[in-house]
Structure formats: structure tokens, C-alpha cells
Amino acid sequence: APTSSSTKKTQLQLEHLLLDLQMILNGINNYKNPKLTRMLTFKFYMPKKATELKHLQCLEEELKPLEEVLNLAQSKNFHLRPRDLISNINVIVLELKGSETTFMCEYADETATIVEFLNRWITFCQSIISTLT
């Protein structure tokens, strides 16, 4: 059973992940807005189901494409270089989803733009955080 300290740690990691994803979304939306149209040509795969920490496997698999899109953006919109930002997210995702069980991600049929993708994972983080508090 999860202890209060492990729950607290999970909550803090999720809050960190949430802040990173929100920072990316804000950076993109500040990106001379219509220049965003070039970033919207990239498509992202969405999880068929995202209700548990193990489903973060689906986010992990999309981090490389996310980094490629962020490389289109001007660095001044982010405090960190895309590579460092994605590396930080990857570390948190790996810790959160754990490595004990191998989970095969199932993707929905519909693909998404970078904005829809980020909003989906922001909602996921908020939902899990709310169950922990």
C-alpha cells in the first residue's frame, strides 16, 4: 500500500510535470501566435485511455516528436532548451510510471495537434493530482 510520504512524492512529481507541460503550452501560445501554424502541422498520438500513472507510457513515447516540434520555436519562449526540457520531463515520467511492469500503450484512432496533445496530458495530471489530495 502507498505510504503518505510516497503519495506526497508522487503528488510533487505530478505537479512538476504539470508545470512543465503548462510552460510548454504557454510558450507555444506566446510564439508570435500565427507562427504556431507551422507547429500545428505536426501530429501527435493520443492515449486511448489515460487514467493511471502507467498510462504515462503513452506520453513517454511522444516526447521525441514533442522535442522536434519545440525545436521550431524560438528559444526565448522557454527557460530551457527543448532537449533539456524534454529530458527533465522524461525523468519525471519514468519515475512516475515505474519500471516494474511493462505497459503497452494503446493509442486512439484520432491524432491531435500539439495544443490538443498538451491539453490532454495537462488534464491527466490535474485529474491524478485531485485523486491524491
Partner: antibody, heavy 116, light 108 residues
Framework: QMQLVQSGAEVKKPGESLEISCEGS????????IGWVRQMPGKGLEWMGI????????RYSPSFQGQVTISADKSISTAYLQWSSLKASDTAVYYC?????????WGQGTLVTVSS | SYELTQPPSVSVSPGQTARITCSGD??????AYWYQQKSGQAPVMVIY???KRPPGIPERFSGSSSGTMATLTITGAQVEDEADYYC???????????FGGGTKLTVL
Amino acid sequence: QMQLVQSGAEVKKPGESLEISCEGSGYSFSTYWIGWVRQMPGKGLEWMGIIYPDDSDTRYSPSFQGQVTISADKSISTAYLQWSSLKASDTAVYYCARGGGPFDYWGQGTLVTVSS
Amino acid sequence: SYELTQPPSVSVSPGQTARITCSGDALPRKFAYWYQQKSGQAPVMVIYEDSKRPPGIPERFSGSSSGTMATLTITGAQVEDEADYYCYSTDSGGDVSVFGGGTKLTVL
């Protein structure tokens, strides 16, 4: 309403220079990419390149890099396509269009004829 | 340089379903867009982001994408749908865009 109005048809000789224009109205011209598309007689559409008027950030298709120059003057909401030395193979209809990814609005097209 | 490949022509009878394909190596990661161009006119977008229809485009136009192939489907093609259709996308880096070679749709 949103409009892109292009300059009129041109007839030129090989080796001459040319600049055609595209004036945008009904939207914030400086903060939308503007692109140019070539259509040779009886042929398909070819993406030439795009410019972001606010800072003149420009991207060219490898096929058109060095062959044409795309520029913009945001103070008069106008984009330009220039040739320094025309060739007969430049004969085509040239469209300007708004958008960095897909093009959502198009000009009426400018016919450029290059013939000796 | 990046290429999108389309069949040169597709013919259907009125009321039949027309399918126009577009293949490109980057399409698993890049959205496809479709333009209709009638003779002597500027192109008009009929599908964006693989499968979405802009306002004013009839419901008979639909789009899909799987792997390296995007498809424009016209269910119950009408005579007024006779036109050239172009797929459009960007290369894997997102910097350069490209049109397919175009498909002439004949509805007879």
C-alpha cells in the same frame, strides 16, 4: 473582409527583372505568414516559400532557393516576389496565399509570361 | 527534397464514391491538407488536419490518414466536384511545405 489582391499580368523578355506584389487587407498582415505558389501552364501547384512579415523570417523550397526573392513591407501590408533575371520557364500563374502551414486565403493569381 | 505522390487521374460516375490517395514518408507525423482547384480559379481547402472540414465544405468530402497514406473521399460525387485535387503537407522538419502532383477528378 479578408482579401489578398495581387498585381496585374506581366509580359517580359528573358533576362529582364520583375517584381509582383500581393496586398493583404482585413486582417493583421504582419502576424500571418504569406506564401507564394507557382502553377505553370497545365501543371500542378508548387510551393515556393513563405515569409513572416513582422520579422521577415523567410523559408524557401529547395527548388526555388536562389531563383527568386520573397520579401514583405509590413507598413503597407504587401508581400513581393522578385526575379533578377527571368527565363522562359518562369512563365506561370503565381498565387500568393496566407498561412504558414496550410494556406487558408488565396490571391487571384498573377500571370507572368516570359517570351522573346 | 520531400515528395507527395498522387494518382494523376480518378474517374467516377455521378453518385459514386471517389477516393484520391496521397503518399509521403512524413505523413505518419505530419497532417495532410487537401485543396480543390477548378479550372481558372484559385485553390480552395476542402480538408485540413487529415480529416477536418472547413466551414462551407459539403459533408460528402471527408479525409483520413493511416501510416504514410492520406485519402480524400468524396461520397456521392457530383458533377460540380470535377476539379483538380492536391494534397499538401510539410516535410519532417516542418520548415518546407509541398504539394502533391495533383489528381484530376472526372465525374461523368
